[in-house]
């Protein structure tokens, strides 16, 4: 039950996170004009990954797309790439995790397969979250660098006669959305990986074959050993006896003609 809850919660948290990453990527307010001492401005500038916008005091807003690809800063291109990779990985992770959910039955899919899918989606969510966090952090670093550069030459002019106010940009809402969304996706991914450990079958029944030891009339039945998932810390071999109680999370095996001597 705890495993199902952890997996379900991981899925929901990741879903919210990826929705947030998509929202942040599409938002126009990655950087906003720094208003420092002036909270009301006649012309307010803000920029996104895909276009820059200007809002006038009348409320009129004009946005212009970055129609050039080669003319854009390499850092901006890198941020775009990171966010898109994050979205793609997250979307694939969501698709995989839907089929991995314990509450969803698809044919006769074994729990080991579900465990593997849960792990795969978990890793995808972790990488997706890291991509988003990295993308947003790179952009934030770029803003900080530019902010201090423009502060250093806040006013440039000809012989001090004419002043040109340089627009400074600070963190926009999209950065905070991106950081939170990336964090949520990361947490969701970790939860999926934790759920995977619980989903991995503790014990797997192997179909018994009767061996007749010479000089004995007793049939020997080899024990079923714990399936190796690569995540199990228990390296001891456990003997399994027929008729033992099985938990919901264990693989069900049905009697075959070799099970009984």
């Amino acid at each position: 039950m705890a495993v199902t809850a952890c997996q379900g919660l991981g899925f929901v948290v990741s879903l919210i996170g990826i929705a947030g990453i998509i929202a942040a990527t599409c938002m126009d307010q990655w950087s906003t004009q720094d208003l420092y001492n002036n909270p009301v401005t006649a012309v307010f500038n803000y920029q996104g990954l895909w276009r820059s916008c200007v809002r006038e005091s009348s409320g009129f807003t004009e946005c212009r797309g970055y129609f050039t690809l080669l003319g854009l800063p390499a850092m901006l291109q890198a941020v775009r790439a990171l966010m898109i990779v994050g979205i793609v990985l997250g979307a694939i992770g969501l698709l995989v995790s839907i089929f991995a959910l314990k509450c969803i039955r698809i044919g006769s899919m074994e729990d080991s397969a579900k465990a593997n899918m849960t792990l795969t989606s978990g890793i995808m969510f972790i990488v997706s979250g890291l991509c988003a966090i990295a993308g947003v952090s790179v952009f934030a670093n770029m803003l900080v660098t530019n902010f201090w550069m423009s502060t250093a030459n806040m006013y440039t002019g000809m012989g001090g006669m004419v002043q040109t106010v340089q627009t400074r940009y600070t963190f926009g809402a999209a950065l905070f959305v991106g950081w939170v969304a990336g964090g949520l996706t990361l947490i969701g991914g970790v939860m999926m990986c934790i759920a995977c450990r619980g989903l991995a079958p503790e014990e797997t029944n192997y179909k018994a074959v009767s061996y007749h030891a010479s000089g004995h009339s007793v049939a020997y039945k080899p024990g079923g050993f714990k399936a190796s998932t690569g995540f199990g810390s228990n390296t001891k071999n456990k003997k399994i006896y027929d008729g033992g109680a099985r938990t919901e999370d264990e693989v069900q095996s049905y009697p075959s003609k070799h099970d009984y001597v």
Epitope: Q33, N38, V40, T41, A42, V43, N45, Q47, S52, C53, V54, E56, S57, S58, G59, F60, E62, R64, V162, Q163, T164, V165, Q166, T167
Partner: antibody, heavy 119, light 113 residues
């Protein structure tokens, strides 16, 4: 047809206050800023501030922050400006103007209200 | 505050003549976000309120005759009347529409001979 009708001329005593109105018609009052501009022969045109009737937000020129108070009544599509502690320096023609949708300009103006401050 | 300086303060011309008046701002009115210059021009005829002629430094307001042309960028702007008519007798003001407080120039008085 967009039109801004301002209240009539005022003759007021020094130290008193005056409240003038600007009634808008021909457009959605709440969707546009209303700016107030002072005109004197000596100082020319000076921007006092503006009010955004839709959100009841306003912004003032620092010079007039303690002198003028801008309000608006959306139900009657009327903007008001009250000038307090009047002095001879406040004798002027006061215009209300609609903030244009583009370029932070003033696209329609009222006919003006003449305020004369007497000693 | 941005200071707007207009020149000449007055000029007298004959009808049909081309007129040019200038406006200088103490700071650039060019917005880097949309590469637009936030400057407006107004015409005030005697006994009337000002009338918007030009916004964004060069865009004519609807209904304004095409003989009025605005140009310039940054800190230097020009209003040109290609062929002056008798009804153009007025004072012309330029306005900083870029930063609060909005400021207006002292005006250029156009007189007809």
């Amino acid at each position: 047809q967009t039109y801004l009708q301002q209240s009539g001329a005022e003759l007021v005593r020094s130290g008193a206050s005056v409240k003038m109105s600007c009634k808008a018609s021909g457009y959605t009052f709440a969707s546009y800023n209303i700016h107030w501009v002072k005109q004197t022969p000596g100082q020319g045109l000076e921007w006092i501030g503006y009010i955004y009737p839709g959100k009841d937000g306003s912004h003032y020129n620092q010079k007039f922050r303690d002198k003028a108070t801008l309000t608006a009544d959306t139900s009657s599509s009327t903007a008001y400006m009250q000038i307090s502690s009047l002095t001879s320096e406040d004798s002027a023609v006061y215009f209300c103007a609609r903030g244009g949708y583009y370029g932070n300009s003033f696209d329609y103006w009222g006919q003006g209200t003449l305020v004369t401050v007497s000693a | 505050d941005i200071v707007m300086s207009q020149s000449p303060s007055s000029l007298t011309v004959t009808t049909g003549e081309k007129v040019t008046m200038t406006c200088k701002s103490s700071q650039s009115l060019l917005n880097s976000g949309n590469l637009k210059n936030y400057l407006a021009w107004y015409q005030q005829k005697p006994g009337q309120p000002p009338k918007l002629l030009i916004y964004w430094a060069s865009i004519r307001e609807s209904g304004v005759p095409d003989r009025f042309t605005g140009s310039g960028s940054g800190t230097d702007f020009t209003l040109t009347i290609i062929s002056v008519q008798a009804e153009d007798l007025a004072i012309y003001y330029c306005q900083n529409a870029y930063t609060f407080p909005f400021t207006l120039g002292g005006g250029t008085k156009l007189e007809i001979k």
